[in-house]
Amino acid sequence: EEELQVIQPEKSVSVAAGDSATLNCTVTSLIPVGPIQWFRGAGPGRELIYHQKEGHFPRVTSVSESTKRNNMDFSIHISNITPADAGTYYCVKFRKGSPDVEVKSGAGTELSVRAKPSAPVVSGPAVRATAEHTVSFTCESHGFSPRDITLKWFKNGNELSDFQTNVDPAGKSVSYSIRSTARVVLTRRDVHSQVICEVAHVTLQGDPLRGTANLSEAIRVPPFLEVTQQSMRADNQVNVTCQVTKFYPQRLQLTWLENGNVSRTEMASALPENKDGTYNWTSWLLVNVSAHRDDVKLTCQVEHDGQPAVNKSFSVKVSAHPKEQGSNTAAENTGTNERDYKDDDDKHHHHHH
Protein backbone atom coordinates (compact mmCIF):
# COMPACT_ATOMS: atom_id res chain seq x y z
CA GLU A 1 0.00 0.00 0.00
CA GLU A 2 1.06 3.58 -0.64
CA GLU A 3 2.43 5.55 2.29
CA LEU A 4 -0.23 7.58 4.04
CA GLN A 5 -0.33 11.31 3.30
CA VAL A 6 -2.33 13.86 5.25
CA ILE A 7 -3.56 16.55 2.91
CA GLN A 8 -4.70 19.97 4.06
CA PRO A 9 -5.48 21.64 0.73
CA GLU A 10 -5.82 25.22 1.97
CA LYS A 11 -2.77 27.05 3.26
CA SER A 12 -5.01 29.68 4.80
CA VAL A 13 -8.66 30.33 5.50
CA SER A 14 -10.15 33.68 6.44
CA VAL A 15 -13.43 33.88 8.35
CA ALA A 16 -15.48 36.73 9.78
CA ALA A 17 -15.96 36.67 13.54
CA GLY A 18 -19.25 34.98 14.39
CA ASP A 19 -19.22 32.82 11.27
CA SER A 20 -18.20 29.19 10.96
CA ALA A 21 -14.92 27.88 9.56
CA THR A 22 -14.36 24.68 7.63
CA LEU A 23 -10.86 23.22 7.83
CA ASN A 24 -10.32 20.54 5.22
CA CYS A 25 -8.25 17.41 5.70
CA THR A 26 -8.12 14.15 3.80
CA VAL A 27 -5.87 11.14 4.15
CA THR A 28 -4.72 9.04 1.24
CA SER A 29 -4.92 5.66 2.96
CA LEU A 30 -7.03 3.72 5.43
CA ILE A 31 -3.77 2.41 6.86
CA PRO A 32 -2.82 2.63 9.63
CA VAL A 33 -6.03 2.36 11.60
CA GLY A 34 -6.25 5.07 14.20
CA PRO A 35 -7.85 8.38 14.96
CA ILE A 36 -7.41 11.81 13.50
CA GLN A 37 -6.74 14.66 15.87
CA TRP A 38 -6.78 18.37 15.11
CA PHE A 39 -4.42 20.73 16.89
CA ARG A 40 -3.89 24.46 16.90
CA GLY A 41 -0.19 25.19 16.80
CA ALA A 42 2.70 22.77 16.67
CA GLY A 43 5.18 21.40 19.16
CA PRO A 44 4.69 20.41 22.78
CA GLY A 45 2.38 23.32 23.60
CA ARG A 46 -0.09 22.58 20.82
CA GLU A 47 -3.77 22.80 21.72
CA LEU A 48 -6.14 19.90 21.02
CA ILE A 49 -9.09 21.16 19.00
CA TYR A 50 -10.79 17.90 18.03
CA HIS A 51 -10.20 14.23 18.75
CA GLN A 52 -12.08 11.75 16.61
CA LYS A 53 -11.88 9.07 19.26
CA GLU A 54 -12.60 10.84 22.51
CA GLY A 55 -13.50 14.09 24.23
CA HIS A 56 -16.24 16.68 24.03
CA PHE A 57 -15.77 19.52 21.54
CA PRO A 58 -19.03 21.48 21.50
CA ARG A 59 -18.04 23.94 18.76
CA VAL A 60 -16.37 21.38 16.50
CA THR A 61 -18.07 18.83 14.28
CA SER A 62 -16.69 16.51 11.64
CA VAL A 63 -17.84 17.46 8.16
CA SER A 64 -18.22 13.90 6.92
CA GLU A 65 -19.58 10.98 8.88
CA SER A 66 -16.57 9.47 10.59
CA THR A 67 -18.39 6.13 10.75
CA LYS A 68 -18.81 6.05 6.96
CA ARG A 69 -17.11 3.11 5.29
CA ASN A 70 -13.78 3.98 3.64
CA ASN A 71 -13.95 7.45 5.14
CA MET A 72 -10.81 9.42 4.37
CA ASP A 73 -12.26 12.89 4.91
CA PHE A 74 -11.52 14.30 8.33
CA SER A 75 -12.45 17.91 7.70
CA ILE A 76 -13.91 19.80 10.62
CA HIS A 77 -16.37 22.62 11.07
CA ILE A 78 -15.81 25.16 13.86
CA SER A 79 -18.81 27.29 14.75
CA ASN A 80 -19.05 30.82 16.13
CA ILE A 81 -15.49 31.83 15.35
CA THR A 82 -13.89 34.50 17.53
CA PRO A 83 -10.53 36.26 17.13
CA ALA A 84 -9.18 33.93 19.82
CA ASP A 85 -9.57 31.04 17.33
CA ALA A 86 -6.95 32.46 14.97
CA GLY A 87 -3.87 30.30 14.42
CA THR A 88 -2.50 27.43 12.38
CA TYR A 89 -4.49 24.21 12.56
CA TYR A 90 -2.91 20.81 11.95
CA CYS A 91 -4.71 17.62 11.01
CA VAL A 92 -2.72 14.75 12.51
CA LYS A 93 -3.11 11.02 11.88
CA PHE A 94 -2.44 8.63 14.75
CA ARG A 95 -1.91 4.89 14.82
CA LYS A 96 -4.19 3.07 17.21
CA GLY A 97 -2.37 2.03 20.35
CA SER A 98 -2.01 2.51 24.08
CA PRO A 99 -1.40 5.36 23.78
CA ASP A 100 -2.11 6.22 20.14
CA VAL A 101 1.06 7.05 18.23
CA GLU A 102 1.40 10.05 15.91
CA VAL A 103 2.02 8.95 12.33
CA LYS A 104 1.84 12.03 10.15
CA SER A 105 0.70 15.63 10.25
CA GLY A 106 -0.77 17.77 7.53
CA ALA A 107 1.04 20.93 6.47
CA GLY A 108 -1.35 23.11 8.45
CA THR A 109 -4.05 25.63 7.60
CA GLU A 110 -3.76 29.14 8.97
CA LEU A 111 -7.10 30.43 10.19
CA SER A 112 -7.32 34.20 10.23
CA VAL A 113 -10.34 35.84 11.76
CA ARG A 114 -11.72 39.02 10.34
CA ALA A 115 -13.04 40.97 13.31
CA LYS A 116 -14.62 44.40 13.11
CA PRO A 117 -13.08 47.24 15.05
CA SER A 118 -15.14 48.57 17.93
CA ALA A 119 -16.83 51.95 17.49
CA PRO A 120 -14.10 54.58 17.79
CA VAL A 121 -14.20 56.48 21.06
CA VAL A 122 -12.87 60.04 20.91
CA SER A 123 -11.81 61.74 24.10
CA GLY A 124 -10.69 65.33 24.47
CA PRO A 125 -8.49 67.23 26.91
CA ALA A 126 -9.21 67.11 30.64
CA VAL A 127 -9.16 70.90 30.91
CA ARG A 128 -10.45 73.56 28.58
CA ALA A 129 -8.11 75.71 26.53
CA THR A 130 -8.53 79.08 24.88
CA ALA A 131 -8.25 80.10 21.25
CA GLU A 132 -4.85 79.83 19.59
CA HIS A 133 -3.90 77.00 21.94
CA THR A 134 -3.39 73.44 20.71
CA VAL A 135 -5.39 70.66 22.30
CA SER A 136 -5.10 66.90 21.85
CA PHE A 137 -7.89 64.49 21.01
CA THR A 138 -7.45 60.73 21.33
CA CYS A 139 -9.29 58.11 19.30
CA GLU A 140 -9.32 54.44 20.30
CA SER A 141 -10.74 51.35 18.64
CA HIS A 142 -10.20 47.73 19.64
CA GLY A 143 -10.65 44.09 18.72
CA PHE A 144 -10.04 44.16 14.99
CA SER A 145 -8.25 41.69 12.76
CA PRO A 146 -6.37 41.62 10.43
CA ARG A 147 -3.95 44.33 11.58
CA ASP A 148 -4.21 46.58 8.52
CA ILE A 149 -6.41 49.56 9.32
CA THR A 150 -6.75 53.19 8.21
CA LEU A 151 -7.54 56.07 10.55
CA LYS A 152 -8.29 59.65 9.51
CA TRP A 153 -9.10 62.79 11.48
CA PHE A 154 -11.46 65.57 10.37
CA LYS A 155 -12.41 68.93 11.80
CA ASN A 156 -15.70 70.21 10.46
CA GLY A 157 -15.24 67.97 7.42
CA ASN A 158 -11.68 69.05 6.70
CA GLU A 159 -9.03 66.36 7.00
CA LEU A 160 -6.38 66.96 9.64
CA SER A 161 -2.73 66.05 9.20
CA ASP A 162 -1.24 66.64 12.64
CA PHE A 163 -1.80 63.28 14.33
CA GLN A 164 0.12 60.21 15.46
CA THR A 165 -1.27 56.67 15.27
CA ASN A 166 -0.21 53.40 16.84
CA VAL A 167 -1.52 49.88 16.24
CA ASP A 168 -0.82 47.38 19.01
CA PRO A 169 0.60 44.89 19.45
CA ALA A 170 3.40 45.18 16.92
CA GLY A 171 3.75 41.39 16.58
CA LYS A 172 1.25 38.69 15.69
CA SER A 173 -1.94 38.68 17.72
CA VAL A 174 -5.48 37.40 17.58
CA SER A 175 -6.77 40.97 17.53
CA TYR A 176 -5.43 44.50 17.51
CA SER A 177 -6.11 47.95 18.91
CA ILE A 178 -5.51 51.37 17.41
CA ARG A 179 -4.87 54.61 19.26
CA SER A 180 -4.41 57.94 17.55
CA THR A 181 -3.79 61.41 18.98
CA ALA A 182 -4.62 64.49 16.92
CA ARG A 183 -3.48 68.04 17.71
CA VAL A 184 -6.07 70.72 17.01
CA VAL A 185 -5.48 74.48 17.15
CA LEU A 186 -8.53 76.19 18.64
CA THR A 187 -10.16 79.36 17.34
CA ARG A 188 -12.85 81.51 18.98
CA ARG A 189 -15.30 80.18 16.40
CA ASP A 190 -14.87 76.51 17.47
CA VAL A 191 -17.71 76.26 19.98
CA HIS A 192 -19.82 74.52 17.35
CA SER A 193 -16.90 72.67 15.79
CA GLN A 194 -16.55 68.91 15.81
CA VAL A 195 -13.64 66.54 15.38
CA ILE A 196 -14.27 63.18 13.76
CA CYS A 197 -12.10 60.08 13.92
CA GLU A 198 -12.80 57.76 10.99
CA VAL A 199 -11.67 54.14 10.95
CA ALA A 200 -11.65 52.03 7.77
CA HIS A 201 -11.09 48.26 7.87
CA VAL A 202 -11.58 45.33 5.50
CA THR A 203 -14.44 44.03 7.65
CA LEU A 204 -16.46 47.22 7.21
CA GLN A 205 -17.07 46.82 3.46
CA GLY A 206 -16.11 50.41 2.70
CA ASP A 207 -18.43 51.86 5.33
CA PRO A 208 -16.06 53.36 7.90
CA LEU A 209 -16.82 53.75 11.58
CA ARG A 210 -16.79 57.23 13.07
CA GLY A 211 -16.30 58.63 16.51
CA THR A 212 -16.91 62.29 17.28
CA ALA A 213 -16.08 64.87 19.90
CA ASN A 214 -17.42 68.38 20.23
CA LEU A 215 -14.86 71.14 20.64
CA SER A 216 -17.37 72.81 22.95
CA GLU A 217 -16.09 70.37 25.59
CA ALA A 218 -12.52 71.52 25.06
CA ILE A 219 -12.72 75.23 24.43
CA ARG A 220 -13.03 78.27 26.64
CA VAL A 221 -13.82 81.57 24.99
CA PRO A 222 -13.09 84.34 27.50
CA PRO A 223 -15.49 87.29 27.55
CA PHE A 224 -15.02 90.82 26.34
CA LEU A 225 -15.99 93.37 28.97
CA GLU A 226 -17.28 96.88 28.36
CA VAL A 227 -18.58 99.23 31.03
CA THR A 228 -20.56 102.25 29.88
CA GLN A 229 -22.65 104.97 31.46
CA GLN A 230 -26.13 105.38 30.11
CA SER A 231 -27.85 108.74 29.86
CA MET A 232 -28.68 110.51 33.12
CA ARG A 233 -31.89 109.39 34.72
CA ALA A 234 -34.19 111.44 36.91
CA ASP A 235 -33.49 111.83 40.60
CA ASN A 236 -29.71 112.09 40.09
CA GLN A 237 -29.46 108.41 39.15
CA VAL A 238 -26.76 107.16 36.81
CA ASN A 239 -27.24 103.84 34.95
CA VAL A 240 -23.95 102.01 34.46
CA THR A 241 -23.95 98.96 32.18
CA CYS A 242 -21.47 96.08 32.08
CA GLN A 243 -21.63 94.20 28.80
CA VAL A 244 -20.03 90.74 28.85
CA THR A 245 -19.84 89.37 25.34
CA LYS A 246 -18.75 86.38 23.28
CA PHE A 247 -17.96 83.98 26.11
CA TYR A 248 -18.20 80.21 26.44
CA PRO A 249 -19.09 78.19 28.44
CA GLN A 250 -21.97 79.89 30.19
CA ARG A 251 -20.55 79.44 33.70
CA LEU A 252 -19.96 83.04 34.72
CA GLN A 253 -20.23 85.13 37.89
CA LEU A 254 -20.41 88.92 37.76
CA THR A 255 -19.73 91.13 40.78
CA TRP A 256 -20.26 94.91 41.00
CA LEU A 257 -17.86 96.79 43.24
CA GLU A 258 -18.44 100.40 44.39
CA ASN A 259 -15.17 101.95 45.46
CA GLY A 260 -13.85 98.46 46.07
CA ASN A 261 -16.80 97.22 48.08
CA VAL A 262 -19.02 94.41 46.82
CA SER A 263 -22.34 95.80 45.80
CA ARG A 264 -23.97 92.83 44.10
CA THR A 265 -23.08 89.39 42.72
CA GLU A 266 -24.95 87.64 39.94
CA MET A 267 -24.68 84.24 38.23
CA ALA A 268 -25.38 83.84 34.54
CA SER A 269 -28.09 81.31 33.72
CA ALA A 270 -30.32 80.31 30.83
CA LEU A 271 -28.75 82.76 28.42
CA PRO A 272 -29.67 82.73 24.75
CA GLU A 273 -26.98 81.44 22.46
CA ASN A 274 -25.28 83.46 19.77
CA LYS A 275 -25.00 81.98 16.31
CA ASP A 276 -21.42 80.97 16.99
CA GLY A 277 -22.39 79.23 20.24
CA THR A 278 -21.07 81.92 22.57
CA TYR A 279 -23.13 83.93 25.06
CA ASN A 280 -23.68 87.60 25.84
CA TRP A 281 -24.84 89.08 29.14
CA THR A 282 -25.58 92.61 30.22
CA SER A 283 -25.84 93.77 33.81
CA TRP A 284 -26.48 97.29 35.02
CA LEU A 285 -26.23 99.26 38.19
CA LEU A 286 -28.18 102.39 39.15
CA VAL A 287 -26.03 104.78 41.17
CA ASN A 288 -27.58 107.68 43.14
CA VAL A 289 -24.84 110.26 42.71
CA SER A 290 -26.42 112.67 45.19
CA ALA A 291 -25.48 110.26 47.97
CA HIS A 292 -21.77 110.62 47.23
CA ARG A 293 -19.45 113.53 47.97
CA ASP A 294 -16.63 112.16 45.76
CA ASP A 295 -16.42 110.44 42.42
CA VAL A 296 -17.58 106.80 42.49
CA LYS A 297 -15.33 104.09 41.07
CA LEU A 298 -17.48 101.27 39.76
CA THR A 299 -15.87 97.96 38.88
CA CYS A 300 -17.46 95.13 36.91
CA GLN A 301 -15.65 91.96 37.98
CA VAL A 302 -16.22 88.82 35.96
CA GLU A 303 -15.11 85.33 36.93
CA HIS A 304 -15.55 83.04 33.94
CA ASP A 305 -15.43 79.24 34.16
CA GLY A 306 -13.30 79.20 37.28
CA GLN A 307 -10.59 81.41 35.76
CA PRO A 308 -9.04 84.41 37.53
CA ALA A 309 -11.39 87.40 37.64
CA VAL A 310 -11.29 90.04 34.95
CA ASN A 311 -12.10 93.64 35.96
CA LYS A 312 -13.33 96.64 34.07
CA SER A 313 -13.76 99.92 35.97
CA PHE A 314 -15.64 103.13 35.34
CA SER A 315 -15.64 106.37 37.31
CA VAL A 316 -18.84 108.29 37.88
CA LYS A 317 -18.08 112.02 38.32
CA VAL A 318 -20.12 113.21 41.28
CA SER A 319 -19.06 116.86 40.87
CA ALA A 320 -20.87 116.96 37.59
CA HIS A 321 -24.21 116.28 39.32
CA PRO A 322 -25.96 118.70 41.77
CA LYS A 323 -26.77 117.14 45.16
CA GLU A 324 -30.29 116.78 46.40
CA GLN A 325 -30.84 118.12 49.94
CA GLY A 326 -31.43 115.64 52.74
CA SER A 327 -30.38 112.59 50.75
CA ASN A 328 -27.34 110.75 51.95
CA THR A 329 -27.83 107.23 50.62
CA ALA A 330 -27.08 105.65 47.31
CA ALA A 331 -30.11 104.18 45.62
CA GLU A 332 -29.37 100.99 43.68
CA ASN A 333 -31.66 98.88 41.61
CA THR A 334 -30.85 95.25 41.02
CA GLY A 335 -29.55 94.75 37.54
CA THR A 336 -31.20 92.07 35.45
CA ASN A 337 -30.09 89.97 32.57
CA GLU A 338 -30.73 91.65 29.30
CA ARG A 339 -32.85 89.12 27.45
CA ASP A 340 -35.09 89.28 24.46
CA TYR A 341 -37.23 86.21 24.91
CA LYS A 342 -39.38 85.32 22.00
CA ASP A 343 -41.31 82.56 23.77
CA ASP A 344 -41.19 80.24 26.71
CA ASP A 345 -39.05 77.71 24.85
CA ASP A 346 -36.27 80.23 24.39
CA LYS A 347 -36.39 80.97 28.06
CA HIS A 348 -35.27 77.43 28.81
CA HIS A 349 -32.88 77.01 25.92
CA HIS A 350 -29.56 75.40 26.86
CA HIS A 351 -26.50 75.01 24.73
CA HIS A 352 -26.21 71.46 23.48
CA HIS A 353 -22.71 70.02 23.18
Epitope: E1, L30, I31, V33, G34, P35, H51, Q52, K53, E54, G55, E65, S66, T67, K68, R69, N70, N71, K96
Partner: antibody
Framework: QVQLVQSGAEVKKPGASVKVSCKAS????????INWVRQAPGQGLEWIAM????????HYNQIFKDRATLTTDTSTSTAYMELRSLRSDDTAVYYC????????????WGRGTLVTVSS | DIVLTQSPDSLAVSLGERATINCRAS??????????IFWYQQKPGQPPKLLIY???NRDSGVPDRFSGSGSGTDFTLTISSLQAEDVAVYYC????????FGQGTKLEIK
Protein backbone atom coordinates in the same frame (compact mmCIF):
# COMPACT_ATOMS: atom_id res chain seq x y z
CA GLN B 1 -8.55 3.17 27.11
CA VAL B 2 -11.44 1.62 25.22
CA GLN B 3 -13.63 -0.62 27.35
CA LEU B 4 -16.80 -2.53 26.52
CA VAL B 5 -18.59 -3.88 29.58
CA GLN B 6 -21.36 -6.37 28.92
CA SER B 7 -24.33 -7.41 31.04
CA GLY B 8 -24.35 -10.66 32.98
CA ALA B 9 -25.27 -14.20 31.94
CA GLU B 10 -28.89 -14.98 31.16
CA VAL B 11 -30.95 -18.20 31.20
CA LYS B 12 -34.03 -18.12 29.01
CA LYS B 13 -36.77 -20.49 27.96
CA PRO B 14 -37.39 -21.27 24.29
CA GLY B 15 -39.64 -18.67 22.67
CA ALA B 16 -38.55 -15.93 25.08
CA SER B 17 -36.48 -12.83 24.31
CA VAL B 18 -33.17 -11.64 25.69
CA LYS B 19 -31.65 -8.15 25.69
CA VAL B 20 -27.90 -7.92 26.17
CA SER B 21 -26.26 -4.57 26.96
CA CYS B 22 -22.78 -3.27 26.18
CA LYS B 23 -21.59 -0.12 27.94
CA ALA B 24 -18.77 1.68 26.14
CA SER B 25 -16.17 3.97 27.68
CA UNK B 26 -12.80 5.48 26.78
CA UNK B 27 -13.91 6.88 23.44
CA UNK B 28 -16.62 8.94 21.73
CA UNK B 29 -19.44 6.44 21.47
CA UNK B 30 -21.13 8.01 18.45
CA UNK B 31 -17.98 7.95 16.31
CA UNK B 32 -17.63 4.19 15.89
CA UNK B 33 -19.73 1.22 14.84
CA ILE B 34 -20.69 -1.46 17.35
CA ASN B 35 -20.81 -5.06 16.10
CA TRP B 36 -22.48 -8.04 17.70
CA VAL B 37 -20.95 -11.49 17.25
CA ARG B 38 -21.91 -14.79 18.84
CA GLN B 39 -20.09 -18.03 19.49
CA ALA B 40 -21.92 -21.24 20.30
CA PRO B 41 -20.10 -23.62 22.67
CA GLY B 42 -17.10 -25.16 20.88
CA GLN B 43 -18.05 -23.43 17.63
CA GLY B 44 -16.71 -20.59 15.52
CA LEU B 45 -17.61 -16.88 15.37
CA GLU B 46 -20.86 -15.77 13.77
CA TRP B 47 -21.53 -12.12 12.96
CA ILE B 48 -25.04 -10.96 13.91
CA ALA B 49 -25.29 -7.26 13.05
CA MET B 50 -23.76 -3.80 13.44
CA UNK B 51 -25.05 -0.35 14.42
CA UNK B 52 -23.79 3.20 13.98
CA UNK B 53 -24.67 4.98 17.26
CA UNK B 54 -24.54 8.41 15.61
CA UNK B 55 -27.66 7.80 13.54
CA UNK B 56 -28.77 4.23 14.41
CA UNK B 57 -27.99 2.95 10.93
CA UNK B 58 -27.90 -0.86 11.11
CA HIS B 59 -26.73 -3.77 9.00
CA TYR B 60 -27.93 -7.28 9.78
CA ASN B 61 -26.82 -10.76 8.87
CA GLN B 62 -29.80 -12.08 6.88
CA ILE B 63 -29.99 -15.06 9.25
CA PHE B 64 -30.86 -12.75 12.15
CA LYS B 65 -32.75 -9.98 10.36
CA ASP B 66 -36.19 -11.00 11.63
CA ARG B 67 -35.22 -11.87 15.20
CA ALA B 68 -32.49 -9.44 16.25
CA THR B 69 -32.84 -5.72 16.99
CA LEU B 70 -29.91 -3.42 17.72
CA THR B 71 -30.39 -0.15 19.59
CA THR B 72 -28.21 2.38 21.39
CA ASP B 73 -28.61 4.93 24.15
CA THR B 74 -26.11 7.68 23.43
CA SER B 75 -26.78 9.38 26.77
CA THR B 76 -25.26 6.39 28.56
CA SER B 77 -23.00 5.17 25.71
CA THR B 78 -24.71 1.82 25.79
CA ALA B 79 -25.54 -0.55 22.93
CA TYR B 80 -28.21 -3.21 23.13
CA MET B 81 -28.91 -6.40 21.22
CA GLU B 82 -32.31 -8.02 21.60
CA LEU B 83 -32.89 -11.53 20.26
CA ARG B 84 -36.46 -12.80 20.10
CA SER B 85 -38.07 -16.23 19.69
CA LEU B 86 -35.13 -17.94 21.32
CA ARG B 87 -34.29 -21.53 20.44
CA SER B 88 -31.91 -23.94 22.13
CA ASP B 89 -29.36 -23.41 19.33
CA ASP B 90 -29.20 -19.73 20.30
CA THR B 91 -27.27 -20.80 23.37
CA ALA B 92 -23.96 -18.94 22.91
CA VAL B 93 -21.62 -16.30 24.21
CA TYR B 94 -22.70 -12.95 22.70
CA TYR B 95 -19.96 -10.39 22.15
CA CYS B 96 -20.13 -6.71 21.36
CA UNK B 97 -17.12 -5.31 19.51
CA UNK B 98 -16.15 -1.80 18.43
CA UNK B 99 -15.02 -1.06 14.88
CA UNK B 100 -12.25 1.52 15.28
CA UNK B 101 -11.41 2.11 11.64
CA UNK B 102 -14.88 1.97 10.07
CA UNK B 103 -13.50 -1.01 8.15
CA UNK B 104 -16.33 -3.30 9.32
CA UNK B 105 -13.83 -5.06 11.52
CA UNK B 106 -13.74 -5.65 15.27
CA UNK B 107 -10.89 -3.88 17.04
CA UNK B 108 -12.04 -3.97 20.66
CA TRP B 109 -14.23 -6.67 22.22
CA GLY B 110 -16.37 -7.00 25.29
CA ARG B 111 -15.82 -10.06 27.48
CA GLY B 112 -19.04 -11.66 26.29
CA THR B 113 -22.42 -12.54 27.76
CA LEU B 114 -23.45 -16.19 28.01
CA VAL B 115 -27.08 -16.71 27.04
CA THR B 116 -28.43 -20.16 27.79
CA VAL B 117 -31.71 -21.24 26.21
CA SER B 118 -33.16 -24.24 27.96
CA SER B 119 -36.58 -25.53 28.82
CA ASP C 1 -22.59 -13.67 0.38
CA ILE C 2 -18.86 -14.24 0.47
CA VAL C 3 -17.86 -17.55 2.05
CA LEU C 4 -14.45 -17.86 3.72
CA THR C 5 -12.82 -21.27 3.98
CA GLN C 6 -9.83 -21.71 6.25
CA SER C 7 -7.26 -24.48 5.95
CA PRO C 8 -6.27 -26.50 7.73
CA ASP C 9 -8.97 -26.89 10.39
CA SER C 10 -6.21 -27.64 12.90
CA LEU C 11 -2.46 -27.41 12.88
CA ALA C 12 0.35 -28.62 15.15
CA VAL C 13 3.70 -26.88 14.90
CA SER C 14 6.88 -27.16 16.96
CA LEU C 15 7.97 -24.23 19.10
CA GLY C 16 10.19 -21.90 17.08
CA GLU C 17 8.86 -23.24 13.76
CA ARG C 18 6.79 -21.42 11.16
CA ALA C 19 3.01 -21.76 11.21
CA THR C 20 0.93 -20.94 8.16
CA ILE C 21 -2.85 -20.65 8.01
CA ASN C 22 -4.75 -20.07 4.78
CA CYS C 23 -8.05 -18.36 4.06
CA ARG C 24 -9.80 -18.58 0.70
CA ALA C 25 -12.72 -16.36 -0.28
CA SER C 26 -15.51 -17.50 -2.58
CA UNK C 27 -14.99 -14.29 -4.56
CA UNK C 28 -12.51 -11.43 -4.54
CA UNK C 29 -12.40 -9.34 -1.41
CA UNK C 30 -10.34 -6.61 -3.09
CA UNK C 31 -11.97 -3.20 -3.46
CA UNK C 32 -10.83 0.42 -3.60
CA UNK C 33 -7.21 -0.74 -3.62
CA UNK C 34 -7.53 -2.68 -0.37
CA UNK C 35 -7.90 -6.36 0.51
CA UNK C 36 -10.70 -6.51 3.05
CA ILE C 37 -9.39 -9.41 5.13
CA PHE C 38 -8.78 -9.42 8.90
CA TRP C 39 -7.20 -12.03 11.17
CA TYR C 40 -8.13 -12.67 14.81
CA GLN C 41 -6.63 -14.77 17.56
CA GLN C 42 -8.87 -16.31 20.24
CA LYS C 43 -7.46 -17.99 23.31
CA PRO C 44 -9.64 -20.24 25.49
CA GLY C 45 -12.09 -18.33 27.67
CA GLN C 46 -11.24 -14.99 26.06
CA PRO C 47 -12.82 -12.79 23.39
CA PRO C 48 -11.08 -12.68 20.01
CA LYS C 49 -8.24 -10.21 19.45
CA LEU C 50 -7.54 -8.40 16.18
CA LEU C 51 -4.10 -9.29 14.78
CA ILE C 52 -4.03 -8.16 11.14
CA TYR C 53 -6.21 -5.69 9.26
CA UNK C 54 -6.61 -5.12 5.55
CA UNK C 55 -4.71 -8.35 4.82
CA UNK C 56 -1.21 -7.29 5.79
CA ASN C 57 -1.21 -4.62 8.49
CA ARG C 58 -0.35 -5.60 12.04
CA ASP C 59 -2.60 -4.12 14.69
CA SER C 60 -1.16 -2.11 17.54
CA GLY C 61 0.85 -4.22 19.99
CA VAL C 62 0.92 -7.33 17.83
CA PRO C 63 4.36 -8.99 17.77
CA ASP C 64 6.15 -8.80 14.45
CA ARG C 65 6.36 -12.61 14.18
CA PHE C 66 2.75 -12.34 12.94
CA SER C 67 2.33 -11.31 9.31
CA GLY C 68 -0.43 -11.36 6.75
CA SER C 69 -0.27 -11.60 2.98
CA GLY C 70 -2.34 -12.30 -0.10
CA SER C 71 -4.76 -10.55 -2.40
CA GLY C 72 -7.95 -11.19 -4.33
CA THR C 73 -9.23 -14.49 -2.94
CA ASP C 74 -6.23 -16.15 -1.25
CA PHE C 75 -4.76 -14.97 2.03
CA THR C 76 -2.24 -16.30 4.53
CA LEU C 77 -1.48 -15.67 8.18
CA THR C 78 2.10 -16.59 9.06
CA ILE C 79 3.69 -16.96 12.49
CA SER C 80 7.40 -16.95 11.75
CA SER C 81 8.55 -18.59 14.99
CA LEU C 82 5.85 -20.19 17.09
CA GLN C 83 5.74 -19.31 20.79
CA ALA C 84 3.84 -21.17 23.48
CA GLU C 85 1.47 -18.22 23.97
CA ASP C 86 0.43 -18.45 20.31
CA VAL C 87 -1.69 -21.53 20.99
CA ALA C 88 -5.20 -20.40 20.03
CA VAL C 89 -7.89 -20.57 17.40
CA TYR C 90 -7.32 -18.19 14.46
CA TYR C 91 -10.12 -16.72 12.38
CA CYS C 92 -10.13 -14.79 9.14
CA UNK C 93 -12.92 -12.29 8.45
CA UNK C 94 -13.86 -10.39 5.34
CA UNK C 95 -15.63 -7.07 5.09
CA UNK C 96 -15.74 -6.31 1.40
CA UNK C 97 -19.42 -6.96 1.93
CA UNK C 98 -20.99 -7.39 5.36
CA UNK C 99 -18.70 -9.22 7.78
CA UNK C 100 -18.36 -13.00 7.62
CA PHE C 101 -15.88 -15.25 9.43
CA GLY C 102 -13.99 -18.34 8.38
CA GLN C 103 -14.67 -21.45 10.40
CA GLY C 104 -11.42 -21.11 12.37
CA THR C 105 -8.08 -22.94 12.56
CA LYS C 106 -6.92 -24.45 15.82
CA LEU C 107 -3.17 -24.07 16.33
CA GLU C 108 -1.40 -26.37 18.77
CA ILE C 109 2.19 -27.13 19.71
CA LYS C 110 3.68 -30.31 18.29
Amino acid sequence: QVQLVQSGAEVKKPGASVKVSCKASGYTFTNYWINWVRQAPGQGLEWIAMIDPSDSETHYNQIFKDRATLTTDTSTSTAYMELRSLRSDDTAVYYCAMDYGSLYAMDYWGRGTLVTVSS
Amino acid sequence: DIVLTQSPDSLAVSLGERATINCRASKSVSSSGYNWIFWYQQKPGQPPKLLIYLASNRDSGVPDRFSGSGSGTDFTLTISSLQAEDVAVYYCQESRELPTFGQGTKLEIK
